[in-house]
Structure formats: structure tokens, C-alpha cells
Interface confidence: medium
């Protein structure tokens, strides 16, 4: 059954643009008007999970790419990852826990909250070329993003 | 409150064509998936398949070359063909509303018709 | 075809816990659900998404998933626990329910 989706950037609170460095890793960094055409643009489905007034299941795929987010654990830690998946399976209303995420939105920005680790956001560290991760909402990390809607 | 109801043939002879249709009372149609179940006499219960709004099916891939789940939006209704059935389709079938308020699982059932194949 | 496998049946003493489990390849990775059935009416929802109650199910059901197991517990088992209780899962593009597990109330 086609499943909804809609296509986003995403850039965190402060305007850091994300960006595929290696084949399986997102960094964030501050773009300008050359090289803005570099950052992800994220295939935003809506699958299974327990939506609510604040918080929407979704999973974030990255456009043109066989690539999700995924949070996973290793070594004791919940990890964010970028996982490669087989393109006539995905993406389904019905996904693997590990790649929902809770859109959460607060005022006028979004939060992604993993589904399989509560109180575990999509982060970005203050520092400019660091790898986006899953942080448990502690420290200076940014979790909050704005949502910038891309035509089909 | 919503509700299914459901409505077909009882009883038929091998080889023939299960027939069975759902009418859903209450809710919006095109916001939930729409399915059939079905229990065989003693038995546990097997997902037959499902249908959107739109008529986009997933089905039981046991199944798949002998079902046929349409819809019909303007009626609020939904229906299940099941060809050439034999006496191992004989079950209750049910329908069943997927909601994406619960997780897309099967939140309403309609009541249950028994199917018996029989010569 | 994919398999969700539950023991047939569970004995429990009223006012004592009954546990049913479901087993299946990497059942922890999705959700699972639980319904029951008393003889002769349709399946009623449980618990979904692992561990969620629907409105109107008593607290004394609850839920887990990890691993390859899924468990549905019932605290304080009353006589009116007494049914077939199915587990629910997805396997790909279709939907596996578990075999049915029979608790009675001794």
C-alpha cells in the first residue's frame, strides 16, 4: 500500500545545514550560497507508531538514496546511523522500530525523538563538521531543527 | 461510534466464489486501512489482506492468487472475492479497520460471518 | 511464510499472574499486539505497539518486546480473563498472527 511521504531540509536552530561527508555519515555545517545545493534533502514518511497531538511517527529517509536514519545500540549507547535498505521494500507504513522517529513540534521548530529510545533526539553539536547524532537532550547539543519544504 | 457490518453467502459448493462486503457507520473511510480476517471452526485467525481509500491492496501471500479486496468510497464499503474456494476455506471471516492510532492495527472488527464450503 | 509461535494454552489461579508469550526471528525489531477472544464474538485489542493499552482495557494487561519474544502479561488474573489470546505482528507486506494461546482460570 503507497505509503505518504513528503520532502524536507532540515537545518538546526542555528542554520547549520546537513550534508552526506561519507557514504554512511551526516555532517553539519554552515553553507553558503555556492555550495547550498550540498545538503540532504530527507524523504519524511509516516509509518507506524503512536501518533498523538505533539508527537507523529515518521521515518527519515534520504532522497534519491536507498539510506535511512536508524538508532541502534553499540557499546551500551544509542546510536544514530545512516542504514542501507533494499529499495523494493522501502519505504512501508509498517517500518522496523529502529528507524521511527516522534516529530515533535515546539513552537515553530521540530524535534525527532527515536521511538526505540525515548528522551534520544537527532543532535548536532555546536562545533561546525561534526557528524549529526543521537543525544540524549544534555549539554549544548541542538535538537531542535526548522523544516524546509521541498517540492516533489 | 464506528461501526462494521458485514454481510454475504453462508454456504457454498467447492470451486465456487467466496462473496463478502463490510459497510463501515461512523468515522471517516479514507483515513484508516481496511482489512479481512478469517477463522477456521477451533481455529486461530489468518490475515487475508488489505485495502486503502484509494484501493491499493497488500495481501497474504498464501493466498494471493485467489483473493480480490475492492473498495467502494462513495458507499463507505469494502469487499472480499475469495475464487475456487474448497472445504479448507471454511472459517468466519471477518472484516477490520486499521487505525493509525493504534499503531495501524486492527482496532474494529464487524461481527463475523460464517463461510461454509460444502458439497 | 513467516511464523509467530505461542504455547496453546496457560493454567493460572485467579489473583495470580499469567504470562503468554509469542516467538518469532527477530520479533523485538517490530510491534507486536495482543487481542482476545471469548468464544463466540470477535477479537478485541489488548495491548498495542509492545506495550500500550487501548481505552477501556484494565491495567492489569500489559506488554513487552524484545529480542525474538514478545510477552503479554496479566496481573491479578480475574475469571472473566478467561479466552484466547492472540499475538499480531507484520512481516514484510503481510500481517502473521500467533497460533492462540488458551489461558484458564483454575
Known amino acids: 500500500v503507497p505509503i505518504r511521504q513528503l520532502h524536507y531540509r532540515l537545518r538546526d536552530e542555528q542554520q547549520k545545514s546537513l550534508v552526506l561527508s561519507d557514504p554512511y555519515e551526516l555532517k553539519a555545517l554552515h553553507l553558503n550560497g555556492q555550495n547550498i545545493n550540498q545538503q540532504v534533502i530527507f524523504s519524511m514518511s509516516f509509518v507506524q507508531g503512536e501518533p498523538s497531538n505533539d508527537k507523529i511517527p515518521v521515518a527519515l529517509g534520504l532522497k534519491g538514496k536507498n539510506l535511512y536514519l536508524s538508532c541502534v545500540m553499540k557499546d551500551g549507547t544509542p546510536t544514530l546511523q545512516l542504514e542501507s535498505v533494499d529499495p523494493k521494500q522501502y519505504p512501508k507504513k509498517k517500518m522496523e522500530k529502529r528507524f521511527v522517529f516522534n516529530k515533535i513540534e515546539v513552537k515553530s521548530k521540530v524535534e525527532f525523538e527515536s521511538a526505540e529510545f525515548p528522551n534520544w533526539y537527532i543532535s548536532t553539536s555546536q562545533a561546525e563538521h561534526k557528524p549529526v547524532f543521537l543525544g540524549n537532550n544534555s549539554g549544548q547539543d541542538i535538537i531542535d531543527f526548522t523544516m524546509e519544504s521541498v517540492s516533489s | 461510534q464506528v461501526q462494521l457490518q458485514q454481510w454475504g453467502a453462508g454456504l457454498l459448493k467447492p470451486s465456487e466464489t467466496l462473496s463478502l462486503t463490510c459497510a463501515v457507520y461512523?468515522?471517516?473511510?479514507?483515513?484508516?486501512?481496511w482489512s479481512w480476517i478469517r477463522q477456521p471452526p477451533g481455529k486461530g485467525l489468518e490475515w487475508i489482506g488489505e485495502?486503502?481509500?484509494?484501493?491499493?491492496?497488500n495481501y497474504n501471500p498464501s493466498l494471493k492468487s485467489r483473493v480480490t479486496i475492492s473498495v467502494d468510497t462513495s458507499k463507505n464499503q469494502f469487499s472480499l472475492k475469495l475464487s475456487s474456494v474448497t472445504a479448507a476455506d471454511t472459517a468466519v471471516y471477518y472484516c477490520?479497520?486499521?487505525?493509525?492510532?493504534?499503531?495501524?492495527?486492527?482496532?474494529?472488527w464487524g461481527q463475523g460471518t460464517l463461510v461454509t464450503v460444502s458439497s | 511464510q513467516s511464523v509467530l509461535t505461542q504455547p496453546p494454552s496457560v493454567s493460572v489461579s485467579p489473583g495470580q499472574t499469567a504470562s503468554i508469550t509469542c516467538s518469532g526471528d527477530k520479533l523485538g525489531d517490530k510491534f507486536a499486539f495482543w487481542y482476545q477472544q471469548k468464544p463466540g464474538q470477535s477479537p478485541v485489542l489488548v495491548i498495542y505497539l509492545d506495550n500500550k493499552r487501548p481505552s477501556g482495557i484494565p491495567e492489569r494487561f500489559s506488554g513487552s518486546n524484545s529480542g525474538n519474544t514478545a510477552t503479554l502479561t496479566i496481573s491479578g488474573t480475574q475469571a472473566l480473563d478467561e479466552a484466547d489470546y492472540y499475538c499480531?505482528?507484520?512481516?514484510?507486506?503481510?500481517?502473521?498472527f500467533g497460533g492462540g494461546t488458551k489461558v484458564d482460570i483454575k
Open positions: 499480531y505482528a507484520w512481516a514484510d507486506t503481510y500481517e502473521v
Open positions: 485495502i486503502d481509500h484509494s484501493g491499493s491492496t
Open positions: 477490520a479497520r486499521a487505525s493509525p492510532s493504534s499503531g495501524w492495527t486492527l482496532d474494529y
Open positions: 461512523g468515522g471517516s473511510f479514507s483515513d484508516y486501512y
